[in-house]
Interface confidence: medium
């Protein structure tokens, strides 16, 4: 008799996902010296035992707690970089300065970036068909769980001047409800950190807009003002120049405004 | 500007006994829980212990369980870790780390104390 299986909104778990995990712990450790020590079957274990044979909608940031001993890593407070909206560009930017760092350039970010992931209550199975969706089903689910958790002590580690790049692209530049905006800006520790600069990449080549003036930017200012952590705004107006530039900073050209 | 000073180290033989000290400043040592880390030679971060802001809440690493206890003095702003039954593999430089429990992520602010372990 076939089992009955909870149908969720979302994308079932990635393919082949604990291979995936598996060979990203040990790519990861082979690159960074500093976490050679790392025992990835040892992370392996922890990560499933987050959540399989869990309730996919009931999962606590407890349930993560012996995968985080395991990760355990110092990243240089001073140099973190937060995004929203616009990963990509983030990422190739620490590929170049590479003494700045997004969560998912530690190894804990590293090993979940872009995958998805979930279990069954009782079972010991992956669900592959099918995932909580955050809207659809419910937020307490394994990988907005993982995310909420990395993501604020992340930010609860950050220091002196902060970064975060955001998309001048999408219609709210900075959009409360990413995770960002509901969970790493809340997190950020006023005695440590002096500054939050807000970086706004912008899209159209012939875009001109001051957009460090945009109303949710606005609105980021007052959220980050009322903590007491001062804040700054910078116009991106031609990342790729900008890449250019954080390559070659020596380049004529890249004296002039980016 | 948030700073940690650690002390105590120093070599001790297997068996014995060492208390080490971190003293905060530039933040509300009283508001943040707090945690001690350590680094053996040529291998990589492990956390030991944390504390939470009041003292009221404390959890240890399997390794240090039983042997180590960490505690704080908030009127002082120091942080402090017991440790009891040295072992050869406790050698390491141990940092205190303002930071939620116990991390993942630690910022990289004190300098450390040797502790070294051997007959």
């Known amino acids: 008799v076939p089992r009955w299986r909870q149908q969720w909104s979302g994308p079932g778990t990635t393919k082949r996902f604990p291979e995936t995990v598996l060979a990203r712990c040990v790519k990861y450790t082979e690159i960074h010296p500093e976490m050679r020590h790392v025992d990835c079957q040892s992370v392996w274990d922890a990560f499933k035992g987050a959540f399989i044979s869990k309730h996919p909608c009931n999962i606590t940031e407890e349930d993560y707690q012996p995968l985080m001993k395991l990760g355990t890593q110092t990243v240089p407070c001073n140099k973190i970089l937060l995004w929203s909206r616009i990963k990509d560009l983030a990422h190739q930017f620490t590929q170049v300065q590479r003494d700045m760092f997004t969560l998912e350039d530690t190894l804990l970010g590293y090993l979940a970036d872009d995958l998805t992931w979930c279990g069954e209550f009782n079972t010991s199975k992956i669900n592959y068909q099918s995932c909580p969706d955050w809207r659809k089903d419910c937020s307490n689910n394994p990988v907005s769980v993982f995310w909420k958790t990395v993501s604020r002590r992340f930010a609860e580690a950050a220091c002196d001047v902060v970064h975060v790049m955001l998309n001048g692209s999408r219609s709210k530049i900075f959009d409360k409800n990413s995770t960002f905006g509901s969970v790493e800006v809340h997190n950020l520790q006023p005695e440590k950190v002096q500054t939050l600069e807000a970086w706004v990449i912008h899209g159209g080549r012939e875009d001109s807009r001051d957009l460090c003036q945009d109303p949710t930017i606005k609105e980021l200012e007052s959220i980050i003002s009322k903590r007491n952590i001062q804040f700054s705004c910078k116009n991106i107006y031609r990342p790729d120049k900008f890449l250019q530039c954080v390559k070659n900073p020596e380049d004529s050209s890249c004296t002039s405004e980016i | 500007e948030v700073q940690v000073l650690e002390s105590g180290g120093g070599l001790v033989q297997p068996g014995g006994s060492l208390r080490l000290s971190c003293t905060a400043s530039g933040f509300t040592f009283s508001s943040y829980a707090m945690s001690w880390v350590r680094q053996a030679p040529g291998k990589g971060l492990k956390w030991v212990s944390a504390i939470s802001s009041s003292g009221g809440s404390t959890s240890y690493a399997d390794s240090v369980k039983g042997r180590f206890t960490i505690s704080r003095d908030n009127s002082k702003n120091t942080l402090y870790l017991q440790m009891n039954s040295l072992r050869v593999e406790d050698t390491a430089v141990y940092y205190c780390?303002?930071?939620?429990?116990?991390?993942?992520?630690?910022?990289?602010r004190g300098q450390g104390t040797l502790v070294t372990v051997s007959s």
């Open positions: 780390a303002l930071g939620s429990g116990s991390g993942p992520f630690f910022d990289n």
